[in-house]
């Protein structure tokens, strides 16, 4: 069998809510993942599980299955969605986004996702990590690509 | 280093118009708004009206509405305010400032201020 | 407009003094997200106003702590707990919840 490639493109878009009373912040955030199958054969994606990271701590997770099948030697470019909450005890997070004077409330979350894909019977998992900036401030929607934080090595806001 | 240059002094006849200049180092202008205040000579603070460069959308207090018009050009990082039909009543220090904030860090900066004066 | 009373207009002080300015808005300056943004700035004479405090009682960056914000809805105060001569100067209360945004009159703190 040849590879199946699974490529993080990046977060599509992000949509707030807040729980004034609880001090929460509510964020969908919309990702896109291009999958490759480089087989001469059809593949199936079986599910895929995500989790959203701020400051190595889970705020979001999401699985979805029976996601669809790749035909040989094709591309699916899939969105996923994982809802994510900054609760009360990450109180700061919600004074700065919803800090009114600025317009851009950037901050650094880890994307990790991991696909499964069968094909006769056997299944293969790929997972891939990005940081990513994502503005908690507003909606927003991402031109693909434009909310790669790049610095990998030392996230800050 | 961020910064904020405000254009030079301006004498102007009373009914005439003047566009001031605040041009920004150190940051993106698209991506923060830039607020205008007027300061009349020994007196308060008022607050002008506030732009978002990126779309051109301004929100003005009610008292500047007509006569002061706040525009930006991204390319060369620049906000500006125009003053029309100027009175007694406008000669003032004009600023521009902006905040700027990540998740531990808040920054306020303003421009040094332009001196408007209005005589004939 | 939302607008704000600062009491009193001068405040002559000695130094070393305590100091307490009020502020007063004509209505309420929550904010729909909870947030109360109500500021407090410093101006020197010849200067460009600095930001002391936002959101009522947090001290911006580099603010010394003998400087403190208080109050709620509509009543706010700056305590200054030793006045020191880099401390003189008028003092503006700004309200950046309601648009449009509104300064105070100014408090002019000075020596006795």
């Known amino acids: 069998p040849r590879s199946i490639d699974v490529k993080y493109i990046g977060v599509k878009s992000a949509y707030v809510s807040y729980d004034v009373q609880k001090r929460t912040i509510y964020l969908n955030i919309t990702n896109t993942l291009n999958i490759t199958n480089n087989n001469y054969y059809s593949v199936e994606v079986e599910n895929i599980t995500a989790q959203v990271q701020f400051s190595k701590t889970v705020i979001g997770k999401a699985r979805l299955n029976n996601i669809t099948i790749i035909g040989p030697l094709d591309m699916k470019q899939i969105d996923y969605t994982v809802p994510t909450v900054i609760a009360e005890e990450m109180s700061y997070m919600y004074d700065f986004c919803t800090l009114i004077s600025i317009k851009v409330h950037n901050i650094v979350l880890m994307m990790q996702v991991t696909v499964t894909t069968t094909y006769f019977g056997h299944s293969e998992q790929i997972s891939q990590e990005r940081y990513q900036y994502v503005d908690c401030g507003r909606n927003t929607t991402y031109q693909l690509g434009q909310s790669e934080y790049l610095n990998v090595l030392q996230p800050q806001q | 280093d961020v910064q904020l240059q405000q254009s030079g002094a301006e004498l102007v006849r009373p009914g005439a118009s003047v566009k001031l200049s605040c041009t920004a180092s150190g940051f993106n202008i698209k991506d923060y708004y830039m607020y205008w205040v007027k300061q009349r000579p020994e007196q308060g603070l008022e607050w002008i009206g506030r732009?978002?460069?990126?779309?051109?959308?301004?929100e003005n207090a009610p008292k500047f509405r007509g006569m002061a018009t706040m525009t930006a050009d991204t390319s060369s990082n620049t906000a500006y305010l125009q003053l029309n039909s100027l009175t007694s009543e406008d000669t003032a220090v004009y600023y521009c400032?902006?905040?700027?904030?990540?998740?531990?860090?808040?920054?306020?900066?303003w421009g040094h201020g332009t001196s408007v004066t209005v005589s004939s | 407009d939302v607008l704000m009373t600062q009491t009193p207009l001068s405040l002559p002080v000695s130094l070393g003094d305590q100091a307490s300015i009020s502020c007063r808005s004509s209505?309420?300056?929550?904010?729909?997200?909870?947030?109360?943004?109500l500021e407090w700035y410093l101006q020197k004479p010849g200067q460009a106003p600095k930001l002391l405090i936002d959101k009522v009682f947090n001290r911006f960056s580099g603010v010394p702590d003998r400087f403190s914000g208080s109050g709620s809805g509509t009543d706010f105060t700056l305590k200054i707990s030793r006045v020191e001569a880099e401390d003189l100067g008028v003092y503006y209360c700004f309200q950046g919840s309601h648009v449009p945004f509104t300064f105070g009159s100014g408090t002019k703190l000075e020596i006795k």
């Open positions: 732009i978002d460069p990126e779309d051109g959308d301004t």
């Open positions: 400032t902006t905040r700027i904030g990540n998740l531990y860090h808040v920054m306020d900066y």
């Open positions: 209505q309420s300056i929550v904010h729909s997200n909870g947030n109360t943004y």
